[in-house]
């Protein structure tokens, strides 16, 4: 009986994702075989959050405007171990939307969830950022320094990642 | 090649306003913020405040609050400021300058006198 | 605001004289140190920018350096054209602000 209405209780949990999310792919948590948690097929998962590399090119607005209807937003990228599980999806020769904005182009960039932005955790490439006409950041591939954040024009197409909260059901 | 062309000198009495006028050409205009630097006689340079060409929105230092307002129209390339309420403090050349990379503005304006007399 | 000093308001140099010129910010600027030139007609140009790039089409006899608060301008071969005021500027935050310039004499 216990068993029965556990089960119930994940079917309607995903039926609520399914009009974004036809299909999820779940693995279990733990010892507890009651802790499953999910992200939407065929995106990746990192610690407690989904991801998904858009490779439509998109403005930053129409990009955040894409991961919303997927139940996401522009990634907003916490630590350097995040970031370095994110690159292994990116190709060198692309640059990616982030969640990541100045739209007063006054220097006080924002996250789009509303995470303080911590100069101490952020990775632009040297001399980065450095003009008041670029609003919007990206994520890039430089031959000298790696992977790391670049500001550009915000109406340019670029491709983008997507962030989610993993599924738990 | 970049250019920057401003209106012509302007005398004008105290208390009324003036708008001068920087239209753009050789690049792509609403790529690139206009700001405004204001030179008294014989003194250092002051930076006024920044327009998006793009956007429309101002950024202006403190001290020019309320003394100025910045404009852009994009059909013809031209970026305005106009001075309200004006003083001899005014008296002053304005140049525009375009923004560039690095915080910096990268091409200026031949200035534009604005004489404030009675 | 960040101020910005030129403790030498006027140089006098002869040419082919090598001359530096100081700039000193009220806090650290994190390298977004510009110089301009502007000629006796008003005429402003960049220079340098980021503290040592050359803008282009300036002449290499240019140069700056720096780091943190202190920054100088050098002109290794001067030329009877560099006569003229010179303003370093930050734009590591707004409002952006200059120096007071230094002009910049023939002996």
């Known amino acids: 009986n216990f068993m029965y209405s556990k089960t119930v209780k994940r079917l309607s949990k995903l039926r609520e994702y399914q009009q974004y999310h036809p299909s999820l792919t779940c693995v279990m948590e733990g010892k507890d075989i009651e802790d499953w948690s999910c992200c939407p097929t065929p995106w990746t998962s990192f610690q407690s959050s989904c991801y998904f590399i858009s490779t439509g090119m998109q403005s930053w607005t129409k990009s955040q405007k894409n991961c919303s209807v997927m139940g996401a937003d522009l990634v907003v990228i916490n630590t350097r171990e995040e970031q370095d599980f994110i690159i292994q999806n990116l190709k060198r020769n692309s640059s990616y939307f982030l969640g990541l904005s100045d739209p007063g182009g006054r220097r006080h960039w924002q996250w789009v969830d509303q995470t303080p932005y911590n100069e101490n955790v952020t990775f632009w490439h040297s001399g980065e950022p450095n003009n008041l006409d670029e609003r919007c950041a990206i994520i890039n591939f430089r031959s000298s320094e790696e992977w790391g954040w670049n500001d550009i024009h915000c109406h340019v197409p670029q491709k983008s990642i997507c962030k989610m909260k993993k599924i738990y059901i | 090649q970049v250019q920057l062309q401003q209106s012509g000198a302007e005398v004008v009495k105290p208390g009324a306003s003036v708008k001068i006028s920087c239209k753009g050409s050789?690049?792509?205009?609403?790529?690139?913020?206009m700001h405004w630097v204001k030179q008294a006689h014989a003194k250092s340079l002051e930076w006024i405040g920044v327009?998006?060409?793009?956007?429309?929105?101002?950024n202006y230092n403190q001290k020019f609050k309320g003394k100025v307002t910045m404009t852009v129209d994009k059909s013809s390339s031209t970026a305005y400021m106009e001075l309200s309420r004006l003083t001899s403090d005014d008296t002053a050349v304005y140049y525009c300058?375009?923004?560039?990379?690095?915080?910096?503005?990268?091409?200026w304006g031949q200035g534009t006198l604005v004489t404030v007399s009675s | 605001d960040i101020q910005m000093t030129q403790t030498t308001s006027s140089l006098s140099a002869s040419l082919g004289d090598r001359v530096t010129i100081s700039c000193r910010a009220s806090?650290?600027?994190?390298?977004?140190l510009n110089w301009y030139q502007q000629k006796p007609d008003g005429t402003v140009k960049l220079l340098i920018y980021y503290t040592s790039r050359l803008h282009s089409g300036v002449p290499s006899r240019f140069s700056g350096s720096g780091s943190g608060t202190d920054y100088s301008l050098t002109i290794s071969n001067l030329d009877q054209e560099d006569i003229a005021t010179y303003f370093c500027q930050q734009g590591n935050t707004l409002p952006w602000t200059f120096g007071g310039g230094t002009k910049l004499e023939i002996k």
């Open positions: 327009i998006s060409t793009y956007y429309g929105d101002s």
């Open positions: 050789g690049y792509t205009f609403t790529d690139y913020s």
């Open positions: 300058a375009r923004n560039g990379n690095f915080y910096v503005m990268d091409y």
């Open positions: 806090q650290d600027i994190s390298n977004y």
